[in-house]
Interface confidence: medium
């Protein structure tokens, strides 16, 4: 049999919540070797995929896909897959990104500390991941 | 049309063996589904065997059936589930099922009809 | 080993009653859930899934709601067509543990 592919890793810079009109960086990693990386958004029928993979380290390879400005329609739920000839592999664990008003207050801090899923990681104990979206009949819509 | 139909199930005897196919119609493996084993014992619950991923070739059992139950990915539309070692306990109507095309979160929306396995001497 | 336990094993209401089906997973699956339900000699058929999201085609009398690691299928405005066996699943292959596991079932009775 051939050798299994690791799940994906992703991972939100600078964070998981994300002031209206900032910007949001979503991070897939995986192993070395991949093709493509996909950040698929509620479920595997609308996605974006790109070939622009860099090494990170060396036995992990990322892509990175960026939300300039972020709307309130950007809030949901991400994931990463990744192609490595010939295989797709399994889906990362999610990731929930929040959009939230700009506050503007000095002592308001912009954004939570980066936040990630990975393969080692358990699903979050997180309650508010029940109010996924659904995303019914997309297919292969653009994320952003 | 998407469809997944078992195939295979069958009278057998005690220690005996059995091979069950699941045959997917409308859809292409390569897009990457879980293709699930649940079982059904006559007038119980709903029992999950595994699941392989139908790109990565990752395969995830229960406890209860590793060893003793083997999936695997045998062509680019059919997945099988391997039988060993069959006791009275194993009878039951096999499903295959395939997780969802359009929701995340991995339910098994398309099923099979089933088929029946009857382990008796 | 994830275990899954459903509550009640039965429960018997009237037509427009209520009928509350909770389900207990024995670790953290986040949203990981879906409820089916099935009818005798039929496969089942996909009602809830991520806890809380309505399949298509399934009546909004059913909701799914999470709290923690507790799952709560609850059926409003009873019909006769809902007498069925209710089971919750969950539906996360990971590599931390293994998931699938589904509950006992909810044999749900109209009177």
């Known amino acids: 049999q051939e050798e299994d592919l690791p799940r994906p890793s992703i991972s939100a810079e600078p964070g998981t919540v994300i002031p209206l009109g900032s910007h949001v960086t979503f991070v897939c990693r995986g192993p070395v070797g991949v093709q493509t990386f996909r950040l698929e958004r509620d479920s595997r029928s609308t996605y974006n995929d790109t070939e622009d993979v860099s090494q990170a380290s060396p036995s992990e390879s990322e892509a990175r896909f960026r939300i300039d400005s972020v709307r309130e329609g950007n809030a949901g739920l991400y994931r990463c897959i990744y192609y490595k000839p010939p295989k797709w592999s399994e889906q990362s664990d999610y990731l929930e990104l929040l959009v939230k008003e700009s506050s503007g207050g000095p002592d308001s801090p912009d954004t939570e500390p980066g936040s990630s899923a990975g393969p080692t990681q358990r699903p979050s104990d997180n309650s508010h991941n029940e109010h996924a979206p659904a995303s019914q009949g997309l297919k292969a819509e653009h994320l952003y | 049309e998407q469809s997944v139909e078992e195939s295979g199930g069958d009278l057998v005897k005690p220690e005996g063996s059995l091979t069950l196919t699941c045959t997917a119609s409308?859809?292409?493996?390569?897009?990457?589904?879980?293709m699930c084993w649940v079982r059904q014992a006559p007038g119980k619950g709903l029992e999950w065997i595994g699941c392989i991923h139908s790109s990565s070739g990752n395969i995830y059992y229960a406890s209860w059936a590793k060893g003793r139950f083997t999936i695997s990915k045998t062509s680019s539309t059919t997945v099988d589930l391997q039988l060993t070692s069959l006791t009275a306990a194993d009878t039951a109507t096999y499903f295959c099922a395939r997780d969802s095309e359009v929701y995340g979160w991995n339910p098994n929306d398309l099923w099979g009809p089933g088929t029946l396995v009857t382990v008796s001497s | 080993e994830l275990d899954m336990t459903q509550t009640p094993a039965s429960v018997s209401e009237p037509v427009g009653g209520t009928v509350t089906i909770k389900c207990q997973a024995s670790q953290s699956i986040s949203s990981y859930l879906a409820w089916y339900q099935q009818k005798p000699g039929q496969r089942p058929k996909l009602l809830i899934y991520g806890a809380s999201n309505l399949a298509s085609g399934v009546s909004s009398r059913f909701k799914g709601s999470r709290s923690g690691t507790q799952f709560t299928l609850t059926i409003t405005d009873l019909e006769c067509d809902d007498a069925a066996t209710y089971y919750c699943q969950c539906s996360y292959y990971g590599n931390s543990y293994v998931g699938g596991a589904f509950g006992g079932g909810t044999e749900v009775v109209v009177k």
């Open positions: 409308g859809f292409s493996f390569s897009s990457g589904y879980y």
